[in-house]
């Protein structure tokens, strides 16, 4: 950008240095160079000389006009052609920015991931603003009326130790940039209602050769929450549609879930849980792949997700790696 250059004059922008994207703008350049009556004034945008829409206003001043300016950032400077000077003389420069005021933040969500020690608040910021936009998260105790504010550029982690005003809070988000300010609706929360259990993980799968072969999925969570509801979704990798099974779960031991699947098909599994009756779900777990055998049972490892075949009666899939899951609709 253009900063700390030695100016011999002035450059300014109308209506402003930061403006709404798509506006018409004028950039003015006024030379104040000793012993120079400029023959010509030139404008440069990002180092490239502008050829059109330049108007000479008087002996020392010129205007560059842009219609429908759509660039988020540009470095402008102007120069003068002075008599008896071989090179153009720099007058001054300025960085300009265009963008949008923030949208009203919506879908404000606060959750406490078990064992994290934090309340994590997120929101939908709306359309891209292109300019520096800050968010102030307000947390107000409904019991003590005390309000705390947290400044951030995206989401916020608030230590649960700092939430000393009881269990019930109002949370809202203010968005602000140089072009405007908006405020979300208030979200009312109870700390006990927003806890998301420790992540559920699928550890392995095996297909047992029975009269009708069945696949057993082994999965677990480190949660200390007693009443947990879970969903496991699965599908053939060639399919678009997920099948979903629901479970009421007690994680005092590793869970085993049985599925009767088509032979010689590669399946993918994911699991997620919530505290029973509460609002927020975990994100879906990492994708877990398992290929069912043709006739001989199969064991595959998640660490080796290329289709590995072992001899023997049972072949299982074992989870050791992490793969990216489809986390759309993570919380809710």
């Amino acid at each position: 950008g253009i900063t700390n250059i030695n100016c011999s004059g002035h450059i300014w922008v109308e209506p402003a240095t930061i403006f709404k994207m798509g506006m018409n703008i004028s950039i003015y350049c006024q030379a104040a160079i000793k012993n120079c009556q400029p023959r010509k004034l030139h404008f440069y945008k990002n180092g490239i000389k502008e050829r059109f829409q330049i108007t000479r206003i008087n002996k020392t001043t010129a205007r560059l006009w842009y219609k429908n300016f759509l660039e988020p950032h540009a470095s402008m400077y102007c120069t003068a052609e002075c008599p008896k000077h071989f090179q153009e003389t720099l007058i001054c420069g300025k960085d300009i920015s265009s963008g949008y005021p923030p949208d009203i933040p919506d879908e404000v969500t606060c959750v406490i991931y078990e064992y994290s020690g934090n309340m994590t608040c997120t929101w939908n910021a709306g359309k891209l603003t292109y300019i520096d936009t800050k968010y102030v998260v307000h947390v107000k105790s409904l019991e003590t009326e005390e309000e705390q504010q947290y400044l951030t550029s995206s989401y916020i982690n608030i230590s649960t130790d700092s939430l000393q005003g009881g269990k019930k809070y109002l949370v809202w988000v203010q968005a602000a940039n140089a072009l405007g300010m908006e405020e979300s609706k208030q979200l009312q929360i109870h700390l006990d209602d927003i806890v998301i259990p420790s992540a559920a993980v699928i550890s392995r799968a095996e297909t047992i050769n029975a009269t009708v072969p069945k696949t057993i999925i082994y999965w677990d969570s480190q949660t200390t929450i007693e009443k947990v509801s879970c969903e496991m979704r699965y599908k053939a990798t060639t399919n678009q549609t997920w099948n979903v099974k629901e479970f009421d779960t007690n994680f005092t031991y590793v869970q085993q879930s049985e599925f009767y699947l088509e032979p010689n098909i590669k399946y993918v599994f994911q699991v997620r849980c919530q505290e029973t009756g509460k609002r927020y779900w975990q994100p879906w777990s990492s994708l877990f792949f398992h290929k069912t055998p043709e006739t001989v049972p199969q064991v595959t490892s998640k660490a080796f997700q290329h289709d590995t075949w072992n001899s023997g009666l049972t072949v299982a899939s074992i989870s050791t790696g992490h793969l990216t899951s489809d986390n759309r609709g993570d919380i809710g």
């Epitope: 900063t3 700390n4 109308e14 209506p15 402003a16 240095t17 403006f19 005021p101 140089a178 072009l179």
Partner: nanobody
């Protein structure tokens, strides 16, 4: 509505100093770059110096090394320290705001009423 009030002008001998102030009031939502201009009798208004919101400064060649522009954000005031004054610095000095951002509340440019500086030889 922004009001700009210049002060600090007066009469001074050549080689002397003056400090002009431009106090801005009345704006809550808008941020501005601030510029000093001057106009001598029978002449056009000319640029003297400017300071951006980030503190970067610019000067006319005729005042470089003699004048210094500064700002006090807490007081919403811009200063022009004028040293080694010359008779050709005699003029009415005006300050002007240039808005940094166009927001939903309209931010316009504003001019002050001016303060007279007279330098005698």
């Amino acid at each position: 509505q922004v009001q700009l009030q210049e002060s600090g002008g007066g009469s001074v001998q050549a080689g002397g100093s003056l400090r002009l102030s431009c106090a801005a009031s009345g704006y809550t939502y808008c941020s501005y770059d601030m510029t000093w201009y001057r106009q001598a009798p029978g002449k056009k208004r000319e640029f003297v110096s400017a300071i951006d919101s980030d503190g970067s400064t610019s000067y006319a060649d005729s005042v470089k090394g003699r004048f210094t522009i500064s700002q006090d954000n807490a007081k919403n005031t811009v200063y022009l320290q004028m040293n080694s004054l010359k008779p050709e610095d005699t003029a009415m000095y005006y300050c002007k705001t240039d808005p940094i951002a166009t927001i939903s509340r309209r931010c316009d440019s504003y001019w002050g009423q001016g303060t007279q500086v007279t330098v005698s030889s």
